[in-house]
């Protein structure tokens, strides 16, 4: 007698973070076989879906048309196989983008730096906001908060050719909803090729500043099962 | 083996409550949905709902939504089904079931609640 | 909701027959369906689930088929512990159904 399923996956389409008016698809990835998939927000039901045929059918999506704050928060789901339940997916975290205003991202001293220099963004909003989010583009997209009342500085330390790579900076206005995005500061490490050669794929920051949040582009979805299981897991908690 | 031990017969006026419980032996409580059915005298079988004991999730039949309450009390492996309002149209054998992968597979031997002024 | 429909209510076999019991969802439940066993002053017992396949320590005179809205609860030849009402239940949506039942009584 089979006592548990394995959770399934949950990752939002094209992406976690979604402007306000835009559509978002979530979707869960359990078994074949499944009877129904239901989607949870926030702790509660949110919506039910029955694939038909079951036997054929291993994922189903969930169609947000009109992103807002109302729906930006939590999701999980779950699935059945006759009576028995699944355990609850990860959780996803769904965010609302482009609300109020836009902050101004610079880099100190430059976007161009050598290896070892010491790097800090400073991400700025003048209206009321106390919560700033620096991001790293790519897939593997890292995720900084800064507090300050008009503006917060994010210190990279001293850089490596890791660095490398396009920022763009966020107001949060509460953990799911972010203001429009910053224009992107393009930063350029140089470094001797020794040192590049040996640099890590992504930099090592401080465990209590940084989490690791996979971009769910659809390439890697398709490749990769593990990136599913971490779409934009524990973001901001 | 698998047990679900059901409380003993309760006899009702109309308006009051009920609270029938289940103790569930020979498995892992929270691994598994419990489900309640009820049966009228000489009548069918009538699903009421189920509760997950691990999240407490519950789902009703829309029929039994507004007095049902389903909980389920994870350290002492025993699922509850309270019934308030009781008229005598509820006067039935109430079955506590096991939901697994096959269906309902084990069930309660039922508890009588009869409803009578 | 989905309601079953389950036919006949009631009849009258001898021990030897093959006995028949058909079941009709209102709409497709893709073989999510359940067949139980009855006898008076008993709870329910699983016979089959997911329209075909027999639970643990039934009898192989048991047999469930069926697709889409039409199923069948089969007795190959009927034993005397078998004279009993038959259920049969859907678990496709909310709420789950049964049928009206069937009786199975001695000719």
């Known amino acids: 007698q089979q006592q548990t399923l394995p959770k399934p996956f949950i990752w939002a389409e094209p992406h976690f973070m979604v402007p306000k008016e835009k559509q978002v698809t979530i979707c869960c990835q359990g078994n074949y076989g499944a009877v129904e998939y239901q989607l949870h927000f926030e702790g509660s039901l949110f919506a039910v879906d029955r694939p038909k045929p079951p036997e054929r059918i291993n994922k189903v999506k969930f169609y947000i048309p009109d992103m807002n704050s109302r729906m930006a928060g939590q999701y999980s789901c779950i699935y059945r196989v006759g009576e028995l339940w699944s355990e609850p997916s990860n959780l996803l975290d769904l965010v609302v983008t482009e609300m109020y205003d836009t902050p101004t991202l610079s880099v100190h001293p430059g976007p161009e730096v050598i290896s070892g220099e010491k790097v800090t963004f400073y991400c700025r909003l003048d209206t009321a906001t106390s919560m700033f989010l620096l991001l790293k583009e790519g897939r593997s997209s890292h995720v900084q908060r800064g507090y300050g009342k008009v503006q917060a500085e994010f210190p990279l330390g001293p850089v490596t050719t890791a660095h490398r790579g396009t920022y763009r900076c966020f107001g949060s206005y509460n953990n799911h909803a972010w203001s429009f995005p910053s224009e992107p500061v393009k930063l350029l490490v140089t470094g001797d090729i020794e040192n590049t050669s040996l640099a890590p794929e992504d930099p090592t920051f401080p465990a209590d500043t940084w989490g690791t949040y996979l971009l769910t582009t659809e390439t890697g979805l398709q490749k990769d099962h593990a990136l599913w299981d971490h779409t934009a897991q524990n973001l901001l908690r | 083996q698998v047990q679900l031990v059901q409380s003993g017969a309760e006899v009702k006026k109309p308006g009051a409550s009920v609270k029938v419980s289940c103790k569930a032996s020979g498995y892992t409580f929270t691994s598994f949905t419990m489900h309640w059915v009820r049966q009228a005298p000489g009548q069918g079988l009538e699903w009421i709902g189920y509760?997950?004991?691990?999240?407490?999730?519950?789902e009703y039949n829309q029929k039994f939504k507004d007095r049902t309450t389903l909980t389920a009390d994870k350290s002492t492996s025993t699922a509850y089904m309270e019934l308030s309002s009781l008229r005598s149209e509820d006067t039935a054998v109430y079955y506590c079931?096991?939901?697994?992968?096959?269906?309902?597979?084990?069930w309660g031997q039922g508890t009588l609640v009869t409803v009578s002024s | 909701d989905i309601q079953m429909t389950q036919s006949p209510s009631s009849l009258s076999a001898s021990v030897g027959d093959r006995v028949t019991i058909t079941c009709r969802a209102s709409?497709?439940?893709?073989?999510?369906l359940a067949w139980f066993q009855q006898k008076p002053g008993k709870a329910p017992k699983l016979l089959v689930y997911a329209a075909t396949n027999l639970a643990d320590g039934v009898p192989s005179r048991f047999s469930g088929s069926g697709s889409g809205t039409d199923y069948t609860l089969t007795i190959s030849s009927l034993q005397p512990e078998d004279f009993a009402t038959y259920y049969c239940q859907h678990f496709w949506g909310t709420p789950r159904t049964f049928g009206g039942g069937t009786k199975v009584e001695i000719k």
């Open positions: 709409e497709n439940i893709y073989s999510n």
């Open positions: 079931v096991r939901g697994s992968s096959r269906g309902f597979d084990y």
């Open positions: 509760i997950n004991p691990s999240s407490g999730y519950t």
